[in-house]
Interface confidence: low
């Protein structure tokens, strides 16, 4: 006797090792979601007794988006936070066609790497929809067979040249949120910039080797943009 | 009130001992005072994972007399309103053996400060 | 045993307040969705919309949507529906049902007949 | 919004008869999504099939579930005489619709 294909879990999959009967398999929230705490992510291959037919439980698991790319965390005096709104799934995939069944596409919510430079952090987030890329992402403690999937990223970036445009999670406004001490901060860095270039013209041979090296620092103040920083990010926007 | 939870605890973990439950449930291994109640309400949270997961009747009692338990401590502490600390979600998930030593030892926080 | 248990039937006049409820037990209430189903006399049933304890998280149906509130208690494990106005065309029998998780609902409470009548 | 639609409205058969119930979708459902209930008068509806073919537990083996995308089937094979009701069929997801249901008499 074996269990037909388990149900459909909001943003989770699910990979099936074995169909046969009292095997216990785990759902696994997509990634850029989490388990909600208090809700379990088991389903098991029972047999009703009274009609001899197997079937699988239903799991009370609810994937929540994960709320470390959902928060707007608070940031460090030098950041500009860019955050937007999650909005509430109406349907079960974004593209309005219904999920299957079961999906061999199982990733844990991923712990995605980024390199975290001062003055802007890299965010993971991604959309309900499959087939986008994840950075970097490990096997579940279960065993399951990660997806190297396409991950969204949004920039939270002090540099203020977020090109316009509309989240992949379909957020149209961007809530920019200047603290009081970012502003001093400008302005010190302002000054210190001007130093820089007033120095630069008296010491020509240091300058130059003090440029390279303020040019080198990430792109804290948003004054000359490196290509590459905002590319990673931006082509989702 | 907080030392019966204890002991419901352990007799969580002996219950728990015969069986497989391969579970990993969100733990917060290093509780900050500042933020115990949402700690704990997050732990007691998890512990329904581990009743539903069991599938045992004498698990299920035992997790249910618990929260109350907790719950009833807490309430006695009056309304602690805790900002700035993880959520429940935001906490490295760890196995049932782990997370059961750590909520024992938030609970020993309790009893110390109460 | 998981069982829905609904509030008694009432009978109410047109623009009064009313709100139902729904207690549950057997198992835990702030894990699986309740969702509030109307049937209004002699015709087919109609979702209202849904509920997740856990969160509090409310999804309605867009024919309800503004028309009627659904919220829940946790601590007494019990989903609520009211409305803040009722109308005659309210006259209906609301059921109460267990959501397995997006699933269908596994699990219904008895019904609450609600007439409105001046 | 997807519109489920049974027929026939009305059945009429006997005790012993096979019974077959349809459900159509204005648009493709998938079949993890679909569910039939079953409700006799004064009570409350009863799950009897979902994921379009699944028995919800304590269901008889009598009734059988079938069918995908956008017409799907709800079969008694044998009825009887605590089987007539009216039926419904339902869409569940993050949206829930019911079909307007079939009665199914005795003749």
């Known amino acids: 006797i074996t269990c037909p294909p388990p149900m459909s879990v909001e943003h989770a999959d699910i990979w099936v090792k074995s169909y046969s009967l009292y095997s216990r398999e785990r759902y696994i929230c997509n990634s850029g979601f989490k388990r909600k705490a208090g809700t379990s992510s088991l389903t098991e291959c029972v047999l009703n007794k009274a009609t001899n037919v197997a079937h699988w439980t239903t799991p009370s698991l609810k994937c929540i988006r994960d709320p470390a790319l959902v928060h707007q965390r608070p940031a460090p005096p030098s950041t500009v936070t860019t955050a937007g709104v999650t909005p509430q799934p109406e349907s079960l995939s974004p593209s309005g066609k219904e999920p299957a069944a079961s999906s061999p596409s199982s990733n844990n919510t991923a712990a995605t790497t980024a390199a975290i430079v001062p003055g802007s952090q890299l965010m993971p987030s991604k959309s309900p929809s499959t087939g986008t890329t994840e950075i970097s992402s490990h096997e579940s403690s279960h065993g399951t067979p990660s997806q190297t999937t396409a991950k969204n990223w949004e920039l939270t970036a002090s540099a203020s040249h977020q090109p316009p445009g509309v989240y992949p999670q379909g957020h149209s406004d961007t809530t920019v949120a200047i603290s009081t001490s970012t502003v001093l901060l400008c302005g010190l860095s302002a000054v210190s910039l001007l130093a820089c270039y007033l120095k630069s013209r008296q010491t020509p041979p240091l300058a130059s080797v003090e440029m390279e090296a303020m040019e080198a620092l990430p792109v804290t103040w948003g004054t000359s943009s490196r290509d590459e920083d905002l590319e990673n990010c931006s082509h989702h926007l | 009130n907080w030392v019966n939870v204890i002991s419901d605890l352990k007799k969580i973990e002996d219950l728990i001992q015969s069986m497989h439950i391969d579970a990993t449930l969100y733990t917060e291994s290093d509780v900050h005072p500042s933020c115990k109640v949402t700690a704990m309400k997050c732990f007691l949270l998890e512990l329904q994972v581990i009743s539903l997961e069991s599938g045992d009747a004498s698990i299920h009692d035992t997790v249910e007399n618990l929260i109350i338990l907790a719950n009833n401590s807490l309430s006695s502490n009056g309304n602690v309103t805790e900002s700035g600390c993880k959520e429940c979600e935001e906490l490295e998930e760890k196995n049932i053996k782990e997370f059961l030593q750590s909520f024992v030892h938030i609970v020993q926080m309790f009893i110390n400060t109460s | 045993e998981v069982q829905l248990v609904q509030s008694g039937a009432e009978v109410k006049k047109p623009g009064e307040s009313l709100k139902i409820s729904c207690k549950v037990s057997?198992?835990?209430?702030?894990?699986?969705?309740i969702g509030w189903v109307r049937q209004m006399p002699g015709k087919g049933l109609e979702y209202m919309g849904i509920?997740?304890?856990?969160?509090?998280?409310?999804r309605y149906s867009p024919s309800f949507q503004g028309q009627v509130t659904i919220s829940a208690d946790k601590s007494i494990s019990t989903a609520y529906l009211q409305w803040s106005s009722l109308k005659a065309s309210d006259t209906a029998m609301y059921y109460c049902?267990?959501?397995?998780?997006?699933?269908?609902?596994?699990?219904w409470g008895q019904g609450t007949l609600v007439t409105v009548s001046s | 919004e997807i519109v489920l639609t049974q027929s026939p409205g009305t059945l009429s058969l006997s005790p012993g008869e096979r019974a077959t119930l349809s459900c159509r979708a204005s648009?493709?459902?998938?079949?993890?999504?679909l569910a039939w209930y079953q409700q006799k008068p004064g009570q409350a509806p009863r799950l009897l099939i979902y994921?379009?073919?699944r028995r919800a537990t304590g269901i008889p083996d009598r009734f059988s579930g079938s069918g995908s995308g956008t017409d799907f089937t709800l079969t008694i094979s044998r009825l009887e005489p605590e089987d007539f009701a009216v039926y419904y069929c339902?869409?569940?997801?993050?949206?829930?619709?019911f079909g307007q249901g079939t009665k199914l008499e005795i003749s």
């Open positions: 049902a267990r959501g397995g998780n997006w699933n269908c609902f596994d699990y």
């Open positions: 057997g198992y835990f209430f702030t894990t699986y969705w």
């Open positions: 509920i997740y304890p856990g969160d509090s998280d409310t």
């Open positions: 648009q493709s459902v998938s079949s993890s999504y």
């Open positions: 994921g379009a073919s």
């Open positions: 339902q869409r569940y997801g993050s949206s829930h619709t």
